[in-house]
């Protein structure tokens, strides 16, 4: 999916008002220095591509993020503010959600959500030069 035509300001508002808090809740008890940010993005569409991938694509050691509150809110934000997203992505993410029965917070998941926090922060500062 091409995130170029999304309403970035609305997505940013949703992140600031609620998604960011859910990410912090998920990471509670974890030191902010515990994980190094290894995933980066260069502009807002690229950031959303990476956010979508890390949030909804199962990875080795972490297959349960799609059921988390921040993931549900991310999906809702992309569905309403990215034209055509629902038709191309929702069924795929629904299938992943159904495939996972239990919510298990592994260290790998914590690392992945830490990466997500970094991607979202980068999404909110699109004019910063890439480090």
């Amino acid at each position: 999916y091409d995130f170029t035509n999304c309403d970035f300001e609305k997505i940013k508002a949703a992140y600031l008002s609620t998604i960011s808090k859910d990410l912090i809740t998920y990471m509670s008890g974890t030191k902010s220095t515990e994980f190094n940010n290894t995933v980066s993005c260069s502009n807002r569409p690229h950031c959303l591509t990476e956010i979508q991938s890390l949030t909804f694509n199962p990875t080795a050691g972490c297959a349960s993020l799609a059921k988390e509150m921040f993931a549900m809110k991310t999906k809702a934000a992309l569905a309403i503010w990215c034209p055509g997203y629902s038709e191309t992505q929702i069924n795929a993410t629904q299938a992943m959600k159904k495939a996972r029965k239990s919510k298990v917070t592994t260290n790998k998941c914590l690392e992945q959500v830490s990466q997500l926090q970094g991607l979202w922060r980068r999404f909110n500062r699109p004019l910063l030069k890439q480090q």
Epitope: S17, T18, K73, A76, A79, W81
Partner: antibody, heavy 120, light 111 residues
Framework: QVQLVQSGAEVKKPGSSVKVSCKAS????????ISWVRQAPGQGLEWLGV????????NYAEKFQGRVTITADTSTSTAYMELSSLRSEDTAVYYC?????????????WGQGTLVTVSS | QSALTQPPSASGSPGQSVTISCTGS?????????VSWYQQHPGKAPKLMIY???KRPSGVPDRFSGSKSGNTASLTVSGLQAEDEADYYC???????????FGGGTKLTVL
């Protein structure tokens, strides 16, 4: 029972505000879109705006920007639409409508409607 | 952005078919497969009849069908019945700003 129940009819003076409520039951309120649509007497349907309670960030039709405020309270599964600076042309039946989960632009469940009459 | 364009009225005899058109632009009907149709009887709330151009919600008779060509969407009611007499509204997604546009409505009369 899956339904949207709206507050009762209102009579308002020009220049004042009206706040209409829409209580949801029988479904998970947060992840659906709640849109507000109005219908003036003998006229067609007109979309005012939408909110996804889970996110709390509303989208408004350009025509009503600055005059309409849509909010949602997930603890009571209730959405609200407030319209300010009322004029006689705002006399209409106001409907809340549920936008399907993640497909917010078609409305598969409607409230019974609230008649708002603006008259001096 | 103005409303989608529908004919104000349409009619047919019981058992016949009638088609209602809905014309928009590239930025609404033509740009997305997000057209829906609503039926409204006098004094009642609208009811979803067709969504995503041609899908029917459960409980809607298969006499109701939808299609799209370019910037124009159509609703066809076949085997007309007396209870089909109502106002019909088309609707289309129109981007993240305008979001939803409605047609002006078509009054369907069963003769």
């Amino acid at each position: 029972q899956v339904q949207l129940v709206q507050s009762g009819a209102e009579v308002k003076k020009p220049g004042s505000s009206v706040k209409v409520s829409c209580k949801a039951s029988g479904f998970t309120f947060g992840s659906y879109g709640i849109s507000w649509v109005r219908q003036a007497p003998g006229q067609g349907l007109e979309w005012l705006g939408v909110i996804i309670p889970l996110l709390g960030v509303p989208n408004y039709a350009e025509k009503f920007q600055g005059r309409v405020t849509i909010t949602a309270d997930t603890s009571t599964s209730t959405a609200y639409m407030e319209l300010s600076s009322l004029r006689s042309e705002d006399t209409a039946v106001y409907y809340c409508a549920r936008g399907a989960e993640y497909f917010y632009w078609y409305f598969d469940l409607w409230g019974q409607g609230t008649l708002v009459t603006v008259s001096s | 952005q103005s409303a989608l364009t529908q004919p104000p009225s349409a009619s047919g005899s019981p058992g016949q078919s009638v088609t209602i058109s809905c014309t928009g632009s590239n930025s609404d009907i033509g740009g997305y497969n997000r057209v829906s149709w609503y039926q409204q009887h006098p004094g009642k709330a609208p009811k979803l009849m067709i969504y995503e151009i041609s899908k029917r919600p459960s409980g809607v008779p298969d006499r109701f069908s939808g299609s799209k060509s370019g910037n124009t969407a159509s609703l066809t009611v076949s085997g007309l019945q007396a209870e089909d007499e109502a106002d019909y509204y088309c609707s289309s997604y129109a981007g993240t700003d305008t979001f939803v546009l409605f047609g002006g409505g078509t009054k369907l009369t069963v003769l």
